[in-house]
Interface confidence: low
């Protein structure tokens, strides 16, 4: 059988070559009939056996931490037969470690992040080393862990590599911190070897800073012409924190006139003054207003830092401006009837000027040929006023102060031309009507109806009669239906187209006004030669045909 | 040696969501940083963004409002995902390494894929 | 962003005269970190130099980089025809990483 011991070959060995050990058959009696060979990976360039005595030798440096073992297979052949004198085995080549690897920390560069003015304790981060070497030989991969610079706000527990906090540290005095850790192999004994590393402590922000005013006392203006909204200037606080922790809120907090507000500019964290209600510089010209600010998130922990929000003090200057002449009324509303003289009274408008100085104040109506304003206001006819031709007027009056001219106010006023009974009634279209000559007594020949331009206060009311003449020539009679039209009928059986063709009836048409006016309209009726049912169609055509130049047979 | 091949779909509608796989061969997606540019049709090299093996991402800002890269360590792959596409996005995208190891700054990168083209269109 | 401008647009020589092609940066590329690409037609781009003059394992020494701060520099000392082809600059030196337009290099 096979002989031999466990093989190791120390890693690092300097010398050109290194006996191994010794491969041996127990059949061999030393007479050198046996050839012994190697094979495998290494067989050949790192082991070299003498074929003869089976010595292995190791011919290169080996290094234990890019290979650790090389597993090779043995052969013993007997020369004078060329039979194998043992069957083929295999056999491990050990490379045993020496302490040649410095601790390394791989996933640098570390970086941590930690809350300011965390307590003593607190965990930072773990780092941790890597030695290559064999953790099962001897102290070769076991490591202590040591602070080289952080002191005194950091420690590192010499076994896991857990950097902790041990004094509290001021964000806004210094806000990250370079601290280098070492890792020694060897539990730290003589001729260990180490390795370092840098960990950036950032210390992240927390609100332990409240927003203070710049300034105690801010002046500023506004016009007393300003909008309400209007941004009339800007108060700034700082605040040593930052990012979120440094957000702040402005708010009023005294103002009895109630007229301004303070809004948040959140990009530029100042507070913006605005006016809430328009501001008269005539009424009062100054304001004291006082504001503070707080920050937008504060954790309730940290409300110790808060306790008192910071002031400041605004004064308001109201500016004056020359404001236009100002009307009592926004709009005025005036009646006057129709057909009044020239000259006529219609109403008065007043403006005064708002300001200190009271200017006197100039009217004028803008493109009015109809009616008048004089200084006083007193708006007067310049012509009669017809209802029925324009109901209503739409003025433009303006104001404008004598002292600065332009300083110009203007407001509607609207004018309602009252109405008087100064139109009668009359037909509402022309009526040209037909008769046959066989026609009976009674027969309907048309129906009228009236119209009237004046205005009514309630329901117009018409009254038809036929006139004083046409009521004793009785051919005609007339009813009125009591609803503003009415009939005219035959008053006789048969009508003779060639004596008398066409008759001109006088109708009269009253209102029910006061006075009562009375129109004479005149209907003109055609008699025609109609057929037996008695349609006065065939004589409508016949007139049209005439009036058109033609003959009928 | 190390090898990259991008799969994906060629063609994807407008407004819909592009998605493209970039998958590791020949070596380990641990310790290196991975990054997918794009190259319009006869145009230049857009980066588009990393991911670390970690899970870490780092996106161009002129897409990270429609970005999303991710990593599947088990399969040694990592993922890009372009909402809302448009024509413009069509392109050659291209998956590649940073040639420095473990953490640290950016790097060239010494290792491509060959490239997917995809197409945006209805 | 760092916006690398290159120049020129098109380069139009012949096998064996020497290439100089320029990379502009907008602002100072920290750390020299510049790297040059070159691309094939139907080619991925391959890494040339990185770090604005180490060259990446494998490329021919007639290629060489220089330069600093925003002007950077791809020589190719005696043209080949195999390196006709388009190249491109890239900072990644600050984020987001960032390539020029690119320099057509075209036989006369």
């Known amino acids: 059988g096979w002989v031999w011991n466990q093989f190791f070959v120390p890693e690092e060995m300097n010398t050109t070559s290194h006996h191994v050990g010794r491969l041996r058959s127990d059949l061999d009696n030393g007479n050198n009939s046996f050839q012994y060979k190697l094979l495998g990976a290494g067989a050949g360039s790192t082991f070299i056996i003498d074929e003869r005595t089976g010595d292995i030798y190791a011919i290169e440096k080996l290094d234990r931490e890019e290979r650790s073992l090389y597993i090779l297979r043995a052969q013993v052949i007997d020369i004078t037969t060329g039979r194998a004198v043992e069957p083929e085995s295999e056999f491990v080549i050990k490379v045993s470690d020496i302490n040649d690897n410095e601790p390394k920390f791989l996933d640098e560069p570390y970086e941590a992040i930690v809350p300011e003015m965390s307590p003593e304790g607190t965990l930072v981060i773990q780092v941790t080393a890597s030695d290559a070497d064999d953790p099962s030989s001897g102290n070769n991969a076991r490591l202590l862990y040591s602070l080289l610079q952080g002191q005194p706000y950091f420690s590192v527990e010499p076994t896991t590599g857990v950097i902790r906090i041990s004094s509290k540290m001021d964000r806004e005095l210094q806000d990250e911190y370079w601290v280098i850790i070492q890792a020694k192999d060897m539990i730290g004994q003589p001729g260990a070897l180490s390795g370092t590393t840098s960990v950036l402590i950032k210390l992240s922000d927390v609100n332990d800073n409240k927003p203070i005013f710049k300034e105690s006392l801010y002046r500023l203006t506004v016009s007393e012409s300003a909008p309400t909204g209007t941004s009339i200037g800007t108060i700034m606080a700082y605040d040593n924190d930052i990012g979120e922790n440094a957000e702040m809120d402005y708010s009023i907090e005294e103002d009895d006139s109630q007229t301004f507000d303070i809004i948040t500019n959140h990009e530029t964290q100042e507070g913006i003054v605005i006016l809430k209600k328009k501001v008269n510089f005539e009424h009062q010209n100054h304001y004291g207003i006082r504001a503070k600010v707080k920050n937008h998130h504060v954790d309730k922990q940290l409300m110790k830092y808060h306790t008192e929000a910071s002031t400041t003090f605004i004064k308001i200057q109201v500016e004056d401006v020359d404001e236009p002449p100002l009307f009592l009324l926004p709009y005025y509303i005036f009646e006057i009837f129709e057909e009044t003289p020239q000259g006529s009274f219609v109403g008065v408008v007043s403006a005064t000027d708002p300001d200190n100085r009271k200017s006197p104040i100039r009217y004028s109506i803008t493109r009015s040929k109809v009616f008048n304003i004089d200084d006083n206001g007193t708006i007067t006819t310049t012509n009669s006023l017809d209802r029925e031709i324009s109901a209503w007027y739409n003025l433009s009056i303006t104001a404008t102060e004598k002292y600065n001219i332009e300083q110009i106010s203007s407001i509607p006023v609207y004018v309602q031309v009252l109405n008087i009974n100064d139109h009668a009634p009359e037909f509402s279209q022309y009526y040209e009507s037909y008769v046959c000559e066989n026609a009976g007594s009674g027969q309907v020949i048309q129906t009228i109806s009236a119209v009237d331009r004046d205005e009514s206060i309630e329901e117009h009311h018409f009254y038809f009669n036929l006139s004083v003449e046409d009521t004793n020539s009785s051919s005609f009679t007339i009813i009125d239906n009591q609803d503003n039209t009415a009939v005219i009928l035959t008053n006789r059986t048969g009508f003779n187209l060639q004596e008398e063709p066409i008759f001109y009836i006088s109708i009269l048409i009253a209102d029910n006004g006061i006075p009562s006016l009375t129109s004479t309209n005149t209907l003109t009726i055609h008699v025609c030669d109609c057929d037996d049912s008695g349609s006065t169609q065939t004589c409508q055509y016949q007139e049209l045909m005439l009036s058109m130049g033609f003959k009928t047979e | 040696q190390v090898q990259l091949q991008e799969s994906g779909p060629g063609l994807v509608k407008p407004s819909e969501t592009l998605s493209l796989t970039c998958t590791v061969s020949?070596?380990?997606?641990?310790?290196?940083?991975w990054s997918w540019i794009r190259q319009p049709p006869g145009k230049g090299l857009e980066w588009i963004g990393y991911?670390?093996?970690?899970?870490?991402?780092n996106y161009n800002p002129s897409l990270k409002s429609r970005v999303t890269i991710s990593v599947d360590t088990s399969k040694n792959q990592f993922s890009l995902k372009l909402s809302s596409v448009t024509a413009a996005d069509t392109a050659l995208y291209y998956c590649a390494r940073d040639s420095r190891y473990r953490s640290g700054w950016y790097d060239a990168f010494d290792i491509w894929g060959q490239g997917t083209m995809v197409t945006v269109s209805s | 962003d760092i916006v690398l401008t290159q120049s020129p647009g098109t380069l139009s020589l012949s096998p064996g005269e020497r290439a100089t092609l320029s990379c502009r940066a907008s602002q100072s590329v920290a750390g020299s970190y510049l790297a040059w690409y070159q691309q094939k037609p139907g080619q991925a781009p391959r890494l040339l130099i990185s770090?604005?003059?180490s060259r990446a394992t494998g490329i021919p020494d007639r290629f060489s980089g220089s330069g600093s701060g925003t002007d950077f520099t791809l020589t190719i000392s005696r043209l080949e025809p195999e390196d006709f082809a388009v190249y491109y600059c890239?900072?990644?030196?600050?984020?987001?990483?960032?390539f020029g337009q690119g320099t057509r290099l075209e036989m006369k």
């Open positions: 890239q900072q990644y030196g600050k984020s987001p990483i960032t």
């Open positions: 770090g604005a003059s």
């Open positions: 991911i670390y093996y970690i899970g870490s991402t």
């Open positions: 020949g070596g380990s997606i641990n310790s290196y940083y």
